[in-house]
Interface confidence: low
Amino acid sequence: QPPPPPPDATCHQVRSFFQRLQPGLKWVPETPVPGSDLQVCLPKGPTCCSRKMEEKYQLTARLNMEQLLQSASMELKFLIIQNAAVFQEAFEIVVRHAKNYTNAMFKNNYPSLTPQAFEFVGEFFTDVSLYILGSDINVDDMVNELFDSLFPVIYTQLMNPGLPDSALDINECLRGARRDLKVFGNFPKLIMTQVSKSLQVTRIFLQALNLGIEVINTTDHLKFSKDCGRMLTRMWYCSYCQGLMMVKPCGGYCNVVMQGCMAGVVEIDKYWREYILSLEELVNGMYRIYDMENVLLGLFSTIHDSIQYVQKNAGKLTTTIGKLCAHSQQRQYR
Amino acid sequence: SAYYPEDLFIDKKVLKVAHVEHEETLSSRRRELIQKLKSFISFYSALPGYICSHSPVAENDTLCWNGQELVERYSQKAARNGMKNQFNLHELKMKGPEPVVSQIIDKLKHINQLLRTMSMPKGRVLDKNLDEEGFESGDCGDDEDECIGGSGDGMIKVKNQLRFLAELAYDLDVDDAPGNSQQATPKDNEISTFHNLGNVH
């Protein structure tokens, strides 16, 4: 064991170094002192530290630690913030495209339905966007509302064009008949299944990313305990009291101190690992009906098929609905 | 700072998303994110080591500081002495995490449970049933362009997969209203509508 270097007889080095941390020299002793009031940098002999300096060192050590923690998480934080923003935007674009495709389908195939169809399609996709962002909307209700709204227009414009299209009471009857008679066959049910599954997954994916940001932000801004501050001071700054400016902490010692300071934070590890692996599982399953891009961009096609299904069965349906909604129709012609 | 993605080109006339070499789909972007996240899977357990390696620690020096004195780097005293006669490290660990950390752990537990619930087991029966119910109807198969409409002039073609983050200016003339015309806003035409903090390859 080599002998320690002689203490700085004038504390000059310590003073010039401390000045960088705290302008104003009044806290640094002129010459080494016994340091009996020190609580962290317990002296083995004369020391160039005072109680005030010790306090400043503790504050600086905790700040250093906070900055080290922040820089450690910077890349991860950017990664998640960036992707949360990117995916949120991407999903909005998909919804916008899906709406455009559906409107285009109506415009090209059923121009007589367009004004009202555009309105119903718009409302449906607005709800889709809100749902993805966390709104408390029921997907089945959204799909039912779309078909409930579309059917009266299809009936009055395509199946039975002679009827006045402003008839509110027949509209109500038609909305009811739509469900009772399963006018669109199994298509609404099919769309409900696809849309609810894909949107649920999308929504939780975004929620998970936003929670990821919250986790990093929480650990990023942790305030370290006084005990930790003392351990860090002892490791990083107590050597200065002996005039040992250039000496660095031992590696093993640093690890022990850090594990002590980080004990609480490290407890997140198990759940963080699980979070990433669970997110991976979710992402691996995001295909076909669990992929909103796939489902929403194909929706126009399914809606088109559903209208063709209605048209195919138009004769039978018109007769049945004629009987079912006769009361409403009579009142209307009066 | 470079915050924006690449352009994605759309031929508006036929509503066909043009294929741009190497552009990403959303699913590939998701997988890429997971791969990057997995490189941070040990982030919290590795933190103590990371911070030691990013703060001054004796690596090549013969002597190092153990909290009380100058010692030889590989001596027994290098890790041990600094902790003696100080507050108890075990005690520090026993205090448990701060309330904010406990709260965030609870939130993680909750989302993990949700994520697990949502991650369906392999061979999902639903997929099969849906196919039988005619999800992929007509001649427009998986790898082809999906078809809109029946035939003739009413037909519009679209790519089944939207290339990742399609152009932000895309607005069909039937977008929003009975008026059938909507202008794309100047902001939409820009490439930089989000802080991408990096590249979209």
């Epitope: 890349e75 950017f78 913030i81 923003a85 949120q88 935007e89 909005e92 | 700072s1 470079a2 915050y3 924006y4 690449e6 190497h22 902001k187 820009e190 490439i191 930089s192 509508t193 989000f194 802080h195 991408n196 903090l197 990096g198 590249n199 979209v200 390859h201």
Partner: antibody, heavy 107, light 108 residues
């Protein structure tokens, strides 16, 4: 840690070209785009253009279009900015920047 | 292009006092994903600009918590709760919503 180290100061005659380099270290070079920004004496900061370090795609400010070329060499983790047809008003400090990190500047 | 107008041009402050810098944008910098695409930079004498705040209100790592960013419509504010001697320099706002990226004129 992340560092962007730029090439040294240059003195050029009007009409000439200049090529400034920006060597990146401390992160995966291809993961982030690199912007070039200049600051003429007493003027505000001015964005010149950007390169996607992953695939080499570029975006230039209208003001510099045709005069500026931004390239990169992934094997050397280095980005380059070449400005041609120099004029006296191009006298400035030129910075490269990635995410939130900036180079030290090249006069 | 988006024009950013910063005020004041110069701001003399005594250490320990709060300070506030304003940046007004010629158009909204709020993206539909909820983030404001505005950053704040500090350029100390003889140095490169360094990031303080990104995405309107996110403090960059290593930046003291006396710095904060806020937004109200097209008005953005950088606040320093207690100015320290080391905070001397020129502060710039920068928008990243669309190209060309543009900067404010700076506040000294």
């Amino acid at each position: 840690q992340v560092q962007l180290v730029q090439s040294g100061a240059e003195v050029k005659k009007p009409g000439a070209s200049v090529k400034v380099s920006c060597k990146a270290s401390g992160y995966t070079f291809t993961s982030y785009g690199i912007s070039w920004v200049r600051q003429a004496p007493g003027q505000r900061l001015e964005w010149m253009g950007w390169i996607n370090a992953g695939n080499g795609n570029t975006k230039y400010s209208q003001k510099f279009q045709g005069r500026v070329t931004i390239t990169r060499d992934t094997s050397a983790s280095t980005a380059y900015m070449e400005l041609s047809s120099l004029r006296s008003e191009d006298t400035a400090v030129y910075y490269c920047a990635t995410v939130v990190y900036w180079g030290q500047g090249t006069l | 292009e988006i024009v950013l107008t910063q005020s004041p041009l110069s701001l003399p402050v005594t250490p320990g006092e709060p300070a506030s810098i304003s940046c007004r944008s010629s158009q909204s910098l709020l993206h539909s994903n909820g983030y404001n695409y505005l950053d704040w930079y500090l350029q100390k004498p003889g140095q490169s600009p360094q990031i303080l705040i990104y995405l309107g209100s996110h403090r960059a790592s290593g930046v003291p918590d006396r710095f904060s960013g806020s937004a109200s419509g097209t008005d953005f504010t950088l606040k320093i709760s207690r100015v320290e001697a080391e905070d001397v320099g020129v502060y710039y706002c920068m928008q990243a919503l669309q190209t060309p990226l543009t900067f404010g004129g700076g506040t000294k």
